[in-house]
Interface confidence: medium
Amino acid sequence: GITQSPKYLFRKEGQNVTLSCEQNLNHDAMYWYRQDPGQGLRLIYYSQIVNDFQKGDIAEGYSVSREKKESFPLTVTSAQKNPTAFYLCASSSRSSYEQYFGPGTRLTVTEDLKNVFPPKVAVFEPSEAEISHTQKATLVCLATGFYPDHVELSWWVNGKEVHSGVSTDPQPLKEQPALNDSRYCLSSRLRVSATFWQNPRNHFRCQVQFYGLSENDEWTQDRAKPVTQIVSAEAWGRADCGFTSESYQQGVLSA
Amino acid sequence: QLLEQSPQFLSIQEGENLTVYCNSSSVFSSLQWYRQEPGEGPVLLVTVVTGGEVKKLKRLTFQFGDARKDSSLHITAAQPGDTGLYLCAGAGSQGNLIFGKGTKLSVKPNIQNPDPAVYQLRDSKSSDKSVCLFTDFDSQTNVSQSKDSDVYITDKTVLDMRSMDFKSNSAVAWSNKSDFACANAFNNSIIPEDTFFPSPESSCDVKLVEKSFETDTNLNFQNLS
């Protein structure tokens, strides 16, 4: 397949940054595209064979090299006026126009590294009203105050990641929409049966992987360096009054 | 060589049929359709080469115009999983692809028994913090942003409890303002009256209840998945 690394990349303005793209499909041709929010794909550069690359529609501020068939690194130079975007790499065989894409790299460039903040994460417990009204329980996870918006949120129950019953906002929300480098927030819901929530042995954890500064990035602020890190919040199930292990087991067996 | 895609946005109900279009003034030797989910790379769905060609892929039907200047994608009985950006691309003279801007498709789920409600949830660590959850509303209901910049309201998202074959819509609102209340958090959205359900005051010794539990967590996990 095609791999792009890293998935998220963060840089200070004025620095060159290189995005990697590797393919093991034995394809001669490789392509770099830029995609801005809500937009289609715009071709930056493409290469039909080793040592061979051509400018696309928006090559200014970018450079590429193609020493190997498998690799087509893209350098976003300091001359690029608006580098923050989603970058996609693709490859194809010379005989076909069918392109196969990598997973993409999200690049964010900021004026100042002091704008970088990791998220604060909180888990909110289900409302008793929801439990009595629907026999279901929704936990809400809130990640707030982070910049850039390079986060991945996941739910873990009793130590295992879960996907069923989960819904996460498709995009983080700007906390101050008018600001360029506004911090962001993101919410997610996990819904389980009331009986499952009401077992105090069940452990619920919301995990947010934040992609921030690397060890090499300079940091002069007096707060902790906002490096790439995992931030979590948790909750334990809560038994309802008059709820016994027998009635719980009954709930499990009938579910 | 430009490719025009229409419509730019399309929002339909689960189970409905739809057609999206891709047109150009130029002739293309071949044409591709891709589907892209947010934050992911596009995935190739099909390539059409011959004018007048029709290709079927389960519920998706692709057609290439006789003059090789246009193409259509028809989806039968759309599913929420069909949601995404549909991109068409034509073979350029340079061995590169010319991409259209895409059609953003949103397939709204059928909510079986909508039961709209707003609930207040408390932070598991500090009881003075809370969020408001608007849930179980039908897919026709739109959630509006707050006019107050200090109140945050998320877009609605769909949640699928696969083990219970149950889908629901929900949105979340919160604020640091002292006068923020769940009862009117979603007032800008057109929602039914009396949807706010305040939590009853709980008055029992949870410690006593917890003592009686000796449950197998693996069994619990099976119940969840």
Epitope: Q48, I49, V50, N51, Q54, K55, R66, E67, K68 | -
Partner: antibody, heavy 116, light 107 residues
Framework: EVQLQESGPGLVKPSQSLSLTCSVT?????????WNWIRQFLGNKLEWMGY???????NYNPSLKDRISITRDTSKNQFFLNLNSVTTDDTATYYC?????????WGTGTTVTVSS | DIQMTQSPAFLSVSPGERVSFSCRAS??????IHWYQQRTNGSPRLLIK???ESISGIPSRFSGSGSGTDFTLSINSVESEDFADYYC?????????FGAGTKLELK
């Protein structure tokens, strides 16, 4: 800076094999790029003959496919041209070059005359 | 194979003049054409890649244009060191092929 230098006999008899060496300095031939042989006939016409890639695979001009072989010795950072059953039509200046689509780096060339 | 036809075979100009070299491909090659200069007893030197893209170290008086089948290399003010042979080269399809060249001579 990468440099390429061709070497080999300047005179070859018809029906014999032509063997040339290209010595590369300033870049490892296994690190990347395609390593080509291109020849220029007496009337100045240029002909691409073939290449060996950094990973050792080949691509040849179909007009020479039955007679040509391009190999390499990675320990010496050299690649080689072998052309069988030569005729007087193979008299030319032979260049080794680094390239893929376009060819930015050429050797100085070596002239080979095919004559009895 | 794709044929590359260069015309004329000879061009005579004086220093300071503008000159254009023509190259025609036997089929549509988009912009997959490159231009080389070869001085007497020298190796070819890459001047322009992909019809119009400049090469670092090459004087800015050299420029290229065209797409599809018809291409032009221009020197906007010829200098004495520019009297040489000029070749076009397509990399659209294998085998990659060269034009027969145009000789730029001093008038």
């Amino acid at each position: 800076e990468v440099q390429l230098q061709e070497s080999g006999p300047g005179l070859v008899k018809p029906s014999q094999s032509l063997s040339l060496t290209c010595s590369v300095t300033g870049y490892s031939i296994t690190s990347g790029y395609y390593w080509n042989w291109i020849r220029q006939f007496l009337g100045n016409k240029l002909e691409w003959m073939g290449y060996i890639t950094y990973d050792g695979s080949n691509n040849y001009n179909p007009s020479l496919k039955d007679r040509i072989s391009i190999t390499r010795d990675t320990s010496k950072n050299q690649f080689f041209l072998n052309l069988n059953s030569v005729t007087t039509d193979d008299t030319a200046t032979y260049y080794c070059a680094r390239g893929g689509g376009y060819v930015p780096v050429w050797g100085t060339g070596t002239t080979v005359t095919v004559s009895s | 194979d794709i044929q590359m036809t260069q015309s004329p075979a000879f061009l005579s100009v004086s220093p300071g003049e503008r000159v254009s070299f023509s190259c025609r491909a036997s089929q549509n090659i988009g912009t997959s054409i490159h231009w080389y200069q070869q001085r007497t007893n020298g190796s070819p030197r890459l001047l322009i890649k992909y019809a119009s893209e400049s090469i670092s170290g090459i004087p800015s008086r050299f420029s290229g244009s065209g797409s599809g089948t018809d291409f032009t290399l221009s020197i906007n003010s010829v200098e004495s060191e520019d009297f040489a042979d000029y070749y076009c080269h397509q990399s659209h399809n294998w085998p990659t092929t060269f034009g027969a060249g145009t000789k730029l001579e001093l008038k």
